[in-house]
Amino acid sequence: PGPPPGPPRVSPDPRAELDSTVLLTRSLLADTRQLAAQLRDKFPADGDHNLDSLPTLAMSAGALGALQLPGVLTRLRADLLSYLRHVQWLRRAGGSSLKTLEPELGTLQARLDRLLRRLQLLMSRLALPQPPPDPPAPPLAPPSSAWGGIRAAHAILGGLHLTLDWAVRGLLLLKTRL
């Protein structure tokens, strides 16, 4: 006879799964806030900075009532993938000025990647429909100047911070509806 069967496989508690995702998101939110503050200290922002290639804001007070778990996770994953690509681009093409943000920018990239894998796992554990593979995104043009790289960094970190902030709020809300 073979080895005795192991304990019955317990299906994951969705609230606990969501809890750990919230913790990771909160942690990344704090990291992003610190890095954005570091950037502001080194290169003060003059006014607001935008980057057309960044995703548009997906959540607001008005949208909270209609939130559904599959939609939130799919959209959050898509937006964070875009931010991951922008952070990678920033590290590669941002210029020597932004080298002063290393190793923090590298750590942020690794943690963002980890959160994305966590979201993917959460979607499969909750048996949510998996999004189709992402189409290859057009390459991001290198910044036109050193100052262009700094402006892009302000836009990327500011947008990521705002996205994560709403993500925590949305995920906390969804947890109460499970």
Epitope: R26, L29, A45, G47, D48, H49, N50, L57, S60, A61, G62, A63, G158, G159, H161, L162, D165, W166, V168, R169, L172, L173, T176
Partner: antibody, heavy 117, light 110 residues
Amino acid sequence: EVQLLESGGGLVQPGGSLRLSCAASGFTFSHYDMNWLRQAPGKGLEWVGVISYDGSNKYYADFVKGRFTISRDNSKNTLYLQMNSLRAEDTAVYYCARTPGSHFDYWGQGTLVTVSS
Amino acid sequence: QSVLTQPPSASGTPGQRVTISCSGSSSNIGNNAVNWYQQLPGTAPKLLIYYDDLLPSGVPDRFSGSKSGTSASLAISGLRSEDEADYYCSAWDDSLNGVVFGGGTKLTVL
């Protein structure tokens, strides 16, 4: 640097109207939900309402529903509070504040509204 | 009458640790993030703690927040004279569909 500057406060008679403005600068105004809050003299903070970043959704505290209206003009980076049918108990310092999620991360310095005959 | 309940006053001497409590219900603190604001005399409120225990940039780590069930607390260690202010807790309330505050706690540094 993020800045929020309220204006339009003053003395108004009960039953009267007033429109407050909040000029925003130093951030992408059209990305953020915006709120009005108030504080009666010597009292605590009270939330008045919120408007979504694109102006499509608004939530109000029960005590102002039907009397106060929040609006925004993203092209002018300005938030508004139209106050009608004012009462003595609406006397307060009114603040505008930015919301990136569940909290108010930047506040204006406030404008005083006095409702009295 | 405020939806969230805070003690009206608290006090401590310089260097001491003080804690301010905030209690609510499942529709606000129980299900939503708690935020804390500091209001120095004659000034606008300032965000002190968000999402229960996160510190915004520029807030010293002498300040900390925690939450358990339907209650939250703000702790200030190494108390300084400049910490003398009013402190407010806040959370979204699912039943009221709006933001609710505590009545505020006046902190005196003796």
